[in-house]
């Protein structure tokens, strides 16, 4: 199913590169190279001029969602698709445009009072409470942070960065996504390009903190492309 690659607990053998490229609105995390799943990477090169590849909704813009471009298509080649307007078919909330949510397979306008009640019944802030407290519906919902009573602390399972407390972002870790610290000056970060064949990256780092950008470390300029170390540096 498409849902399997989109939210917290997905473990992937086929997804495109994780993490957004510079300037892409949905970019919240960067993926650390070198911590890979065993087995070959079946994801092949996606040309620069094709739509932006993704592995999950949060890598796309606010008016997009992540899915295979063709019905029943290869789950390993997913791209950011335009969100679906009111009364269009959907499978999960993220497919619907802002101000709407998915109800009974159709995008409908968010009735805040109804939706808030629904969320309060099904969402738990941390999976430290184990998944026995959650039902299948709640694990696939995509929520704005104001739907939560509390923000996730470091180590809490999350769906989006807005679920995490200040100074944290929601980043993939193996088969789940947890709140991790935003990177500080001097910390190693991962710079992504929009094209190229990548190994499967399943450990994501957060983005660099405010006033910092992910750049090649000065003393690494002479190194080969494959070993260039990027760190968070002042603009």
């Amino acid at each position: 199913t498409l849902n399997s690659v989109l939210n917290s607990n997905a473990i992937k053998n086929l997804p495109p590169p994780l993490g957004g490229a510079a300037g892409h609105p949905g970019s919240a995390v960067s993926a650390a190279p070198g911590i890979l799943y065993p087995g070959g990477n079946k994801y092949q090169t996606i040309d620069n001029y094709q739509p932006y590849p993704c592995a999950e909704d949060e890598e796309c813009g606010t008016d997009e969602y992540c899915a295979s471009p063709t019905r029943g298509g290869d789950a390993g080649v997913q791209i950011c698709l335009a969100c679906r307007k009111r009364r269009k078919r959907c499978m999960r909330h993220a497919m619907c445009c802002p101000g709407n949510y998915c109800k009974n397979g159709i995008c409908v306008s968010s009735d805040q009072n109804h939706f808030r009640g629904e969320i309060e019944e099904t969402i738990t802030e941390s999976f430290g409470n184990d998944h026995s407290t959650l039902d299948g519906y709640s694990r696939r919902t995509t929520l704005s942070s104001k739907m939560y009573h509390t923000k996730g602390q470091e180590g809490s399972v999350c769906l989006r960065s807005s679920d995490c407390a200040s100074g944290l972002c929601c980043a993939r870790h193996f088969w789940s996504k947890i709140c991790k610290p935003v990177l500080k000056e001097g910390q190693v970060c991962t710079k992504h390009r929009r094209k190229g064949s990548h190994g499967l990256e399943i450990f994501q780092r957060c983005y660099c903190g405010e006033g910092l950008s992910c750049r090649i470390q000065k003393d690494h300029h002479q190194a080969s492309n494959s070993s260039r170390l990027h760190t968070c540096q002042r603009h």
Epitope: T1, S4, I11, R140, I178
Partner: antibody, heavy 117, light 107 residues
Amino acid sequence: QVQLVQSGAEVKKPGSSVKVSCKASGYTFTEYTMHWVRQAPGQGLEWMGVIDPSNGDTSYNQKFKGRVTITADKSTSTAYMELSSLRSEDTAVYYCSSTTGPWFASWGQGTLVTVSS
Amino acid sequence: DIQMTQSPSSLSASVGDRVTITCRASQDISNYLNWYQQKPGKAPKLLIYYKSRLHSGVPSRFSGSGSGTDFTFTISSLQPEDIATYYCQQVHTLPPTFGQGTKLEIK
């Protein structure tokens, strides 16, 4: 309440295969990954691999060099772990574990597999 | 693979004692450390995840600390039902690996 019920004990000959099942209930089977961990008698715990039941994606511990295969049947909410080319060192209790975050929260009761000629 | 080394391998303590178990990783694992309790003939049980976060339903006498390569698991006041083997587990890098265990007995 999450419940994982595993199949019964098995006695196998060296060189043969064993397939252990793990039936899940109390949650939506496709929502959580299922891991397999083994424990040889008097020994520690060893992670074997994991499956995402929603699409069948798997990842294995390379130590088992293609001897282990993990599958899942969504229709019966059951995960399976098959270990081939059995040797005496594979005598162990095999556990399934259903989980959400990077930790193993819910466990099956364990299945003892004895490999003996 | 990352090696996890626990110490001591066994220890004996009295009810009410403060008990400490250490776990050392062969490389930096940040906070990606979990602790499990296993009683004879039973499956392991998650106690602490992400270094120091208490799993649901776990008594507050259990705690975890440390970072990087050195971690500590503490039982502030040992109870008879705490007799078990305790395992640390790293989930920083695949494959997840466990320590060899610490067997805790009552004096």
